[in-house]
């Protein structure tokens, strides 16, 4: 009971709910106050969570009911206020105050185990006590509220292999267990409330316990004897047969390895399939039916992973022994050597013998061979495997011959061997040394004596050595040529000086010097070599870099005077050819008469990204010709307008968008006012040809003979681009740009 | 609507216990005060008691030791036991229910039983 | 208990015209818990009056209630043939719930 300090305040029982009562409405207890003396008219109130609904009050005597059923594992506790009214005076008597109704338990859950399933793992042998797992059940009833939430383990389902501990759920081993035997077990679990006193409530579970393996098994051959077979031709690495050892342990514990125990090791090897764990036996070294028949093998077998504890289990290791059979094959020949190198002098004559190959017969009945060279026609070779020249070679021609000789037994041709042979030719001094380059030599008229006219390097054909040497000499034969003379600088080149001071070009245009080259080859071969020197005049500058030109002209015997009046008249009719094409393209005739064959233009397109020789596809001139277009004649004033109307019909050739057509003009506009823009002159085609030219053909092509009076002047409105064609055709026009 | 009838024996000896039941019908006996009155032959109405639906009582004191009001919400009933019963007990028992125009105090009868006549006599 | 005393004990007056019952209560009655009730011959008592002065539920408004502490006071201001019976006062303001003795009123 509660009375606050004045001596006012409430006054009630201790409130104590049992749950999961039945009645409709259960008298919890009475809520008064100390001043409620029976003279008053006091009214009670309830207030708070459950207040109204979980628990009504009689607001007249203070009496406070549940009226539902309650569980104390949903709630265990309600906080509510009362407080108490005067009726004469609607006003609170005491300060409003907070009690609390307390839902006592009664033992109404049994013990659940949440963590379901269960599940472990134990290995197979483990001693008596091993501890397996421990399983869990809870009550949801009050642990503090006497033995209802007190539980104890007991084993259903599992003697005599397993035990619980009856107060902490742990489930031990309590005998051993053989995986090989049975591999799991499942053990049912009874967890009871009330400390398993009279109406107790109960609970069990399902323990699945598995057994894992231990290697206590050794593998164990199958069979004690296998015979298997293989031929002497099978390579290295060739399966010859498959043996099986069996392993009632399983995973890890069941990876086994075989090996062979004698010396034949080295000849045979057994490797493991991981996913059989058969063995099997494979070739590591080629077997020779004429060196040994057969071969008998011991191989045992063993586990790969053995605990030191276990090891007593796997001594004396299972084996079987193995016999196999070696058989003889018909082998191809075999050459003495993989491959043969061969050497020979350039310049021997034929027949000369180069080398010698030989194959034998492996087999027992040794089969003469018979051999055939391929890879040049410079060679032959006989039956005894010499091979012989049949053509003079030439090291400067070809310096190595790759050659294959193939040998086939007599006896069985199907039998077939190759080697390559490599010949080596080598060299002799057979070529006499020679101008490196053709020299084009001039020398000014006004050349002073000593001045370098030009420098003169050998080339020799042999092989190149290191300490290949070239001796430079003005032949002794050239007795008239004194106006050059030549200096050897030692360095495989030499250089020709003149040996006076000017010289005419009218009286001698051209000197020819004979120059002796000799090498130091073994015996040594000297060539003679002309020089030829045209004079040149050179002006002031002495340069000799524009006689080039100029020679031509001069050797032919044409003076200046005349080479100046040949250009004038080049000029001229070049001049007049022009004018001639202006008039006939303004009378819109052909520049030259149709002929009964039309031509063929290459027309270049460079309106694409490149590609390649789509770019200089020939058109069809008869397709172009019959063109459904006329070319109709428009008044002048329209025609500009007109060609840039066409230019625009020209950019709807792909897609018809405003977007594409603003871009395109855009870069037209940059085109045009590009001052770094390609030289005017030059051809810009494109795919799309319009609708036809207001201006005509410029070209051969389906000209017409209509329009016979064109003005051109409107070409120097289109811009600097066509500033080229207004020059042309316009009359008087006057560039714009 | 709601309606009360008042159902039990018409006569009781004395000393035994007269017992009535009030039968609700056309509404539920939930968050109602129900109450018995009773009226002596030619005389004025004296209040017995009341039950509050959830089990909740409150006697008039001259008659407390003797009254026992219970309450079936399932059946929508209330009983009156009314012990030792003398000659003084005959009367006209009416079964009432108090109005809610007051919420939780108490309040006046608004609907009424039609009555039932207990005699006490041997 | 709160004693409840109406007079008179017979009031004798003609249709059309007013009646004035009394009830005096020997304690001040909190809250003005009192309550008026019309009883005929076999019938159970109807509610007119609460709090004193509230119209029950389908009550005709010639029905009036007035007073509080002690002294209340029904009034009906034409009386009809059918308003002749017995009137009860009842207190609710205290437990227990006490009841007048009942005024009779006759046809004159």
């Known amino acids: 009971d509660y009375k606050d300090d004045d001596d006012k305040g409430w006054v009630w029982n201790q409130f104590f709910v049992p749950e999961e009562m039945n009645t409709t409405s259960h008298h919890i207890g009475q809520l008064r106050s100390d001043l409620d003396n029976g003279n008053n008219s006091f009214q009670y109130k309830l207030l708070g969570a459950g207040a109204g609904s979980t628990f009504i009050i009689d607001e007249r005597t203070g009496d406070i009911y549940a009226i539902q059923k309650l569980d104390r594992e949903e709630r265990s506790l309600y906080i509510l206020r009362a407080q108490v009214i005067d009726i004469a005076t609607g006003r609170a008597v005491e300060p409003e105050s907070e009690f609390v109704i307390k839902v006592s338990d009664i033992n109404d859950n049994e013990p659940k185990f949440l963590d379901e399933p269960y599940e472990a793992i134990v290995p197979e042998m483990s001693p008596e006590g091993t501890l397996v797992i421990q399983v869990t059940a809870s009550d949801a009833d009050d642990p503090s509220s006497g033995n209802n939430a007190r539980l104890l383990y007991s084993l259903l389902q599992g003697q005599p292999y397993f035990s619980v501990e009856p107060t902490t759920g742990v489930i031990r081993i309590s005998s051993k267990m053989d995986r090989e035997l049975q591999d799991e077990y499942w053990v049912i679990i009874q967890a009871k409330d009330m400390i398993g006193q009279p109406g107790a409530l109960s609970g069990t579970t399902s323990v699945l316990i598995k057994l894992s393996d231990v290697n206590d098994n050794k593998p164990i051959f199958k069979e004690s004897f296998y015979r298997f077979t293989i031929s002497e031709s099978a390579p290295i690495g060739t399966s010859i047969g498959k043996i099986m050892a069996y392993d009632d342990d399983i995973g890890e514990n069941a990876e086994m390895e075989y090996s062979i125990e004698d010396d034949d090791s080295k000849i045979f090897d057994i490797i493991i399939d991981n996913d059989t764990q058969e063995g099997i036996v494979i070739l590591k070294k080629k077997v020779d039916f004429e060196q040994q028949s057969y071969y008998g093998i011991r191989a045992k077998v063993k586990n790969c992973h053995v605990d030191e504890e276990l090891a007593p289990a796997h001594v004396n290791a299972s084996t079987t022994y193995i016999k196999v059979q070696v058989e003889d094959e018909d082998e191809p020949p075999v050459f003495l050597l993989p491959y043969y190198i061969l050497e020979i002098p350039e310049g021997k004559p034929y027949g000369t013998i180069v080398g010698t190959v030989s194959a034998t017969d492996p087999d027992r009945r040794q089969s003469p061979m018979r051999y055939y060279l391929t890879g040049s026609k410079m060679f032959d070779i006989n039956d005894n495997g010499t091979i012989i020249t049949t053509n003079m070679l030439d090291r400067e021609v070809s310096a190595w011959y790759n050659l294959t000789v193939t040998a086939t037994e007599t006896y069985n041709v199907q039998q077939i061997s190759s080697a390559h042979v490599y010949v080596q030719v080598f060299n002799i001094n057979d070529n006499a040394p020679e101008f490196s380059q053709f020299y084009e030599t001039y020398v000014c008229e006004n050349a002073e004596s000593g001045e370098i006219v030009q420098i003169i390097s050998a080339i020799d054909r042999d092989e190149s050595i290191e300490d290949h040497h070239f001796y430079f000499n003005h032949s002794l034969e050239d007795t008239n040529n004194s106006s050059f003379m030549l200096t050897d600088n030692q360095d495989n080149t030499a250089v020709i000086l003149s040996n006076r001071t000017g010289f005419n070009l009218k009286e001698e245009p051209v000197f020819y010097m004979i120059i002796l080259i000799a090498d130091n080859g073994i015996p040594s071969l000297t060539s003679t070599n002309t020089l030829t020197i045209q004079v040149c005049d050179c002006g002031d500058s002495r340069n000799t870099e524009t006689c080039a030109n100029k020679g031509l002209l001069f050797i032919m015997g044409f003076r200046t005077e005349a080479i100046i009046a040949i250009m004038i008249c080049v000029m001229v009719i070049f001049g007049f050819f022009f004018l001639i094409l202006a008039l006939k393209q303004r009378r819109k005739e052909t520049l030259f008469p149709e002929k009964t064959e039309d031509f063929r233009e290459n027309i270049f397109c460079y309106d694409d990204e490149g590609g390649g020789e789509e770019d200089s596809e020939a058109f069809d001139i008869v397709e172009l010709r019959q063109s459904t277009v006329m070319r109709e004649r428009k008044p002048q004033r329209s025609k500009s307008a007109e060609i840039r109307s066409l230019y625009r019909q020209s950019l709807q050739v792909g897609p018809d968008s405003a977007i594409f057509r603003k871009f395109i003009l855009e870069k037209l506009e940059e085109a045009n006012t590009d001052p770094c823009a390609p030289p005017f002159d030059s051809l810009q085609t494109f795919a799309y040809e319009g609708t036809g030219s207001s201006a005509g053909s410029l070209s051969s092509l389906a000209s017409r003979d209509t329009d016979q009076e064109d003005d051109f002047d409107y070409l120097n409105d289109l811009g600097p681009r066509f500033k080229r064609l207004a020059s042309m055709f316009g009359s008087a026009v006057q560039p714009n740009n | 609507q709601v309606q009360l009838q008042e159902s039990g024996p018409g006569l009781v000896k004395p000393s035994e216990t007269l017992s009535l039941t009030c039968t609700v019908s056309?509404?539920?006996?939930?968050?109602?005060?129900w109450s018995w009155i009773r009226q002596p032959p030619g005389k004025g109405l004296e209040w017995i008691g009341y039950?509050?639906?959830?089990?909740?009582?409150n006697y008039n004191p001259s008659l407390k030791s003797r009254v026992t009001i219970s309450v079936d919400t399932s059946k929508n009933q209330f009983s009156l036991k009314l012990s030792s019963v003398t000659a003084a007990d005959t009367a006209l028992y009416y079964c009432?229910?108090?109005?809610?125009?007051?919420?939780?105090?108490?309040?006046?009868?608004?609907?009424w039983g039609q009555g039932t006549m207990v005699t006490v006599s041997s | 208990d709160i004693v409840l005393t109406q007079s008179p004990g017979t009031l004798s007056l003609s249709p059309g015209e007013r009646a004035t019952l009394s009830c005096r209560a020997s304690?001040?009655?909190?809250?003005?818990?009192l309550a008026w009730y019309q009883q005929k011959p076999g019938q159970a008592p109807r509610l007119l009056i609460y709090?004193?002065?509230s119209r029950a539920t389908g009550i005709p408004d010639r029905f009036s209630g007035s007073g509080s502490g002690t002294d209340f006071t029904l009034t009906i201001s034409r009386l009809e043939p059918e308003d002749f019976a017995v009137y009860y006062c009842?207190?609710?303001?205290?437990?227990?719930?006490?009841f007048g003795q009942g005024t009779r009123l006759e046809m004159k």
């Open positions: 009842q207190q609710y303001g205290k437990s227990p719930i006490t």
């Open positions: 009432a229910r108090e109005s809610r125009y007051r919420s939780g105090w108490y309040d006046a009868f608004d609907i």
């Open positions: 056309g509404g539920s006996i939930n968050s109602y005060y």
């Open positions: 304690q001040s009655v909190a809250g003005s818990y």
């Open positions: 039950i509050y639906y959830i089990g909740s009582t």
């Open positions: 709090g004193a002065s």
